[in-house]
């Protein structure tokens, strides 16, 4: 069971300091942006991280949403990352959900976070370079020390 608590506005960056944003095709991508670029591209660069109370504490349970014309929420259904047009619900009557991730700090790395899927244990949000695009994907952490699953989350409130 997950019960919604408060929400915060955040900018999410990869290790290259590239900013996560939602492109016109609703794809989550990372791109070089100055602070003014980041502001100019809002709300596509501003993510609503909603925190949830978890009946089985496993880290901070969160959803990640963006409000452009409508609110879309990050999902990892079938291990594929996409934004689904939906509000983060007030309650989820299950111990797993495709939209709930466990946000945890990374040992030895101040201000770095990782996000584990509640639906797929051992699978994390990660940055992957595909041709010239830096994409947000869901990735199994096969090896200790994989830094592609590390992100900076900067509160904008």
């Amino acid at each position: 069971y997950f019960g919604k608590l408060e929400s915060k506005l955040s900018v999410i960056r990869n290790l290259n300091d590239q900013v996560l944003f939602i492109d016109q095709g609703n794809r989550p991508l990372f791109e070089d942006m100055t602070d003014s670029d980041c502001r100019d591209n809002a709300p596509r660069t501003i993510f609503i991280i909603s925190m949830y109370k978890d009946s089985q504490p496993r880290g901070m349970a969160v959803t990640i949403s963006v409000k452009c014309e409508k609110i879309s929420t990050l999902s990892c259904e079938n291990k594929i990352i996409s934004f689904k047009e939906m509000n983060p619900p007030d309650n989820i009557k299950d111990t797993k959900s495709d939209i709930i991730f466990f946000q945890r700090s990374v040992p030895g790395h101040d201000n770095k976070m990782q996000f584990e899927s509640s639906s797929y244990e051992g699978y994390f949000l990660a940055c992957e370079k595909e041709r010239d695009l830096f994409k947000l994907i869901l990735k199994k952490e096969d090896e200790l020390g994989d830094r592609s699953i590390m992100f900076t989350v900067q509160n904008e409130d």
């Epitope: 990869n14 790395h109 201000n111």
Partner: antibody
Amino acid sequence: QVQLQESGPGLVKPSQTLSLTCTVSGGSINSGGYYWSWIRQHPGKGLEWIGHISYRGTTYSNPSLKSRVTISVDTSKNQFSLKLSSVTAADTAVYYCARDRGGGFFDLWGRGTLVTVSS
Amino acid sequence: EIVLTQSPGTLSLSPGERATLSCRASQSVNSGYLAWYQQKPGQAPRLLIYGVSIRATDIPDRFSGSGSATDFTLTISRLEPEDFAVYYCQQYGFSPLTFGGGTRVEIN
């Protein structure tokens, strides 16, 4: 602009502890998001990452050296330090301090200091 | 840990020529978390490229990076006299952070 400068003894005896300090000038070590790092280069060889510290004092070190490495920070002096215990001749190297913006790559380096381990 | 192998060990070229340096990783660096540095004798390394292809501040555009997974390339389109140096690749996709053994670019 921000500059880094290493200091410490150039000669250390085997089995002793190597101690180096890096002074940050032209900016504050408290700048959020930075990791202050140590990297070494054996004579005529490549580079080896030793570890890092944040201004809050959180450290992370290379597993190959971890048991011998201590990294500390003194924000009041704008300095961070490296201690490497039980040194051998294999620890002879140029030691660099460097700034990691938080990603794991190094955009600013000190000039380096040669430390020789010899009796 | 990820081992980075750079080739060739030495590259002998003339000013104005194109230099192509290779860096091969022992396993995939899918995240594209790879950097390149230049080091001149008696000096500290200088960051050239990060994120495979992103030029660091004040780096001239004759330096470019490319590649993915396990194979990465640094290209210097037209060598200037000040470009003769040793070049290192570094991965930051996995801990511990590791560097390649370097490629020396020397004047032919």
